[in-house]
């Protein structure tokens, strides 16, 4: 397998409104060097959900649960979920540069929101 893999194990996640959603992502290598970012949606109109280095994301916390040697955990938790948060979330590895360029995306996790 050439270079790294971005693994989003959950195809879908269902969360009740007001609860928190955990979106899992593991990456098999730090190489090529570059950040991990989370987006909702795909294409040029996608919405940035979390970027470790810059920005203010008050509802997002990082959730590292994996202690396995073979991968690293870049999962996030989004608090106080509302119906407006529904959509497909992508964990994306970037290659460091000027500017950073998208290297590989996970397959996506579809978040659906249930009524309370």
């Amino acid at each position: 397998e050439e270079e790294l893999q971005v693994i989003q194990p959950d195809k879908s996640v269902s969360v009740a409104a007001g609860e928190s959603a955990i979106l899992h992502c593991t990456v098999t290598s730090l190489i090529p060097v570059g950040p991990i970012q989370w987006f909702r949606g795909a294409g040029p109109a996608r919405e940035l959900i979390y970027n470790q280095k810059e920005g203010h994301f008050p509802r997002v916390t990082t959730v590292s649960e994996s202690t396995k040697r073979e991968n690293m955990d870049f999962s996030i938790s989004i608090s106080n979920i509302t119906p407006a948060d529904a959509g497909t979330y992508y964990c994306v590895k970037f290659r460091k540069g000027s500017p950073d360029t998208e290297f590989k995306s996970g397959a996506g996790t579809e978040l659906s929101v249930r009524a309370k």
Partner: antibody, heavy 118, light 111 residues
Framework: EVQLVESGGGLVKPGGSLRLSCAAS????????MSWVRQTPGKGLEWVAT????????YYPESVKGRFTLSRDNAKNSLYLQMNSLRAEDTAVYYC???????????WGQGTTVTVSS | DIVMTQSPASLAVSLGERATISCRAS??????????MHWYQQKPGQPPKLLIY???NLESGVPDRFSGSGSRTDFTLTINPLQAEDVATYYC?????????FGGGTKVEIK
């Protein structure tokens, strides 16, 4: 059993060149990021170069950039470090090391000694 | 560059007692809750050997008297109880950002 065996070290004059090799066995070489780390009594451990599992991406610290070139041959389970324009400060024991995740150094070879002196 | 400062430079501990080594990074080595700090043991005439990866995870085959803790900039390697075969130099290493850097080492001896 994982084995990393370095070769190619020796005595070279300042400005000269050397090519270090690392022969890997006992693991799936093509799945691993590979690196060289050197050690001197004065400066301790210093990262020297890293190459991605497929060989596409290479990284170097400023101290060796433009002088050292890292390559690999996955068909031969081998790693190579071409060192040009060598300086006295490059004198060190050079270790080949594997990194499954491109993070921690999992396995290390026994090292090969490079001495740069006139 | 992230500068790694290890302390003490040397440490003498009685057999069966606790040895504690500290490593401080000049900036955070955390990302998404992962601490990209690792610990190695090096005995004379041998290459370094991975003990602890990502701050607190024990490498396979390493005795559980070794443990690691810490986050962001401050990390600790603990050996408890210290055994005769633990006499060695211990190094911390960060892989959070290039260039990857190492601490200066801590030499552990028996008192």
């Amino acid at each position: 059993e994982v084995q990393l065996v370095e070769s190619g070290g020796g005595l070279v004059k300042p400005g000269g060149s050397l090519r270090l090799s690392c022969a890997a066995s006992g693991f799936t070489f093509s799945s691993y990021v590979m690196s060289w780390v050197r050690q001197t009594p004065g400066k301790g451990l210093e990262w020297v170069a890293t190459i991605s599992s497929g060989g596409t991406y290479t990284y170097y610290p400023e101290s060796v950039k433009g002088r050292f070139t890292l390559s690999r041959d996955n068909a031969k389970n081998s790693l190579y470090l071409q060192m040009n324009s060598l300086r006295a400060e490059d004198t060190a024991v050079y270790y080949c090391a594997s990194q499954l995740t491109g993070s921690e150094f999992d396995y290390w070879g026994q090292g090969t000694t490079v001495t740069v002196s006139s | 560059d992230i500068v790694m400062t290890q302390s003490p430079a040397s440490l003498a501990v009685s057999l069966g007692e606790r040895a504690t080594i500290s490593c401080r990074a000049s900036e955070s080595v955390d990302s998404y809750g992962n601490s990209f700090m690792h610990w190695y043991q090096q005995k004379p005439g041998q290459p370094p050997k991975l003990l602890i990866y990502r701050a607190s995870n024990l490498e396979s085959g390493v005795p559980d008297r070794f443990s690691g803790s810490g986050s962001r900039t401050d990390f600790t390697l603990t050996i408890n109880p210290l055994q005769a075969e633990d006499v060695a130099t211990y190094y911390c290493h960060q892989s959070a950002d290039l260039p990857w850097t190492f601490g200066g080492g801590t030499k552990v001896e028996i008192k």
